[in-house]
């Protein structure tokens, strides 16, 4: 014979535990039914009733299977060095990211919550380490037989041309002028 | 308007039986997910939870009190009663009834009523 | 049964204070605390739920935080009205008030 199915709430047998998407509820000592993502528990169950789930009011949220009385509230709207990568709806809270240039300098659970302009490497000076979305860039002086003219977040230093003929030699913030020779 | 009013005998004599009722408007115990409590507060004292019921007859009880109580309902009437047997100088109180959602914290109370048990 | 302990018990403190109440439980319960205001001949008034949810028409004044098994109530600016007796409740597991926190003016 097939075992027979439980319908929440039901008490679960000594030492088991309840099932996927239920909880144990310890004032009815019951396994109760969870609400879904986007919804929150608005009457919590007894020993002869199940939960009774309500969607989630405007801006907030619920992402996992739950038995919360209240949703959670979205973050706070984007700012002005952000753009927002996921919008607040019932199931997810907003996310927001650095826009291009920007960097992620104090991060949140998801997303960032202070963003701050990449570093330009000034003439002289070349990227080591490109800038990512939580790490700033790391310049570096660029090393003889190369240069950076720029003042630039993303420009390594390169090298100086090759010349027959010096005309000026290159340093760190400019290149080697070459002499044209005429045939 | 919600609001909820205990009555009691005012007072007893030790081992003879408390019984208490709660008159309440402005809600209904037919309605998914209320519930009514009784909370009571000895004189000088703090204030302990005794029992609750639910829309759907579900009831609890504090345990270290539960041989001793008895929560009932006239759902018609919008009364709650709760009876406590072989009434002690110990059960010398103000008793307290407040409605309780359906997420389980009791948001409106009555006045409450002053229960004496003396010889 | 889980046990709320309070304090502290009585509080003194003048007019325009923050005053903050502490209520620890035994075991964890999962924010649901709710605070009240007890005022003599009267019942019970609601402040809080659910660790920090105020209830509608109750001053900001009041603000609740906490969470697991520590949690705590505070009253910014004291005003002569909040003279009262304050508890806590716990909702996680049946229902245990703390012990009562009795304000009063210096």
């Known amino acids: 014979l097939p075992a027979q199915v439980a319908f929440t709430p039901y008490a679960p047998e000594p030492g088991g535990t309840c099932r996927l998407r239920e909880y144990y509820d310890q004032t009815a000592q019951m396994c109760c039914s969870k609400c879904p993502p986007g919804q929150h528990a608005k009457v919590f169950c007894t020993k002869t009733s199940d939960t009774v789930c309500d969607s989630c009011e405007d801006s907030t949220y619920t992402q996992l299977w739950n038995w919360v009385p209240e949703c959670l509230s979205c973050g706070s709207r984007c700012s002005s060095d952000q753009v927002e990568t996921q919008a607040c709806t019932r199931e997810q809270n907003r996310i927001c990211t650095c826009r291009p240039g920007w960097y992620c300098a104090l991060s949140k659970q998801e997303g960032c919550r202070l963003c701050a302009q990449l570093r330009k490497c000034r003439p002289g000076f070349g990227v080591a380490r490109p800038g990512t979305e939580t790490s700033d860039v790391v310049c570096k002086p660029c090393a003889p037989g190369t240069f950076s003219n720029t003042t630039s977040s993303t420009d390594i230093c390169r090298p100086h041309q090759i010349c027959h003929v010096v005309a000026i030699p290159g340093n760190a913030s400019m290149d080697a002028v070459c002499t044209s020779t005429s045939p | 308007q919600v609001t909820l009013k205990e009555s009691g005998p005012g007072i007893l004599q030790p081992s003879q039986t408390l019984s208490l009722t709660c008159s309440f408007s402005?809600?209904?115990?037919?309605?998914?997910?209320?519930?009514v409590g009784w909370i009571r507060q000895p004189s000088g004292k703090g204030l302990e939870w005794l029992a609750h019921i639910w829309w759907d007859a579900d009831k609890y009880y504090n345990p270290a009190l539960k041989s001793r109580l008895t929560i009932s309902k006239d759902t018609s009437k919008n009364h709650v009663f709760l009876k406590i047997a072989n009434a002690d100088t110990a059960d010398t109180a103000t008793y307290y009834c407040?409605?309780?959602?359906?997420?389980?914290?009791?948001?409106?109370w009555g006045t409450g009523t002053t229960v004496t048990v003396s010889s | 049964d889980i046990q709320m302990t309070q304090s502290p018990s009585s509080l003194s403190a003048s007019l325009g204070d923050k005053v903050t109440i502490t209520c620890k439980a035994s075991q964890n319960i999962n924010k649901f605390i709710a605070w009240y205001q007890h005022k003599p001949g009267e019942g019970p008034r609601l402040l809080i739920h659910?660790?920090?949810t105020l209830q509608p028409g109750i001053p900001s004044r009041f603000s609740g935080s906490g969470s697991g098994s520590d949690y705590s109530f505070s009253i910014n600016n004291l005003e002569p009205e909040d003279i009262a007796s304050y508890y806590c409740l716990q909702y996680g597991v049946l229902w245990t008030f703390g012990g009562g926190t009795k304000l009063e003016i210096k």
């Open positions: 659910y660790t920090s």
């Open positions: 402005g809600f209904s115990l037919n309605t998914l997910g209320m519930g």
């Open positions: 407040a409605r309780m959602t359906g997420t389980r914290y009791f948001d409106v």
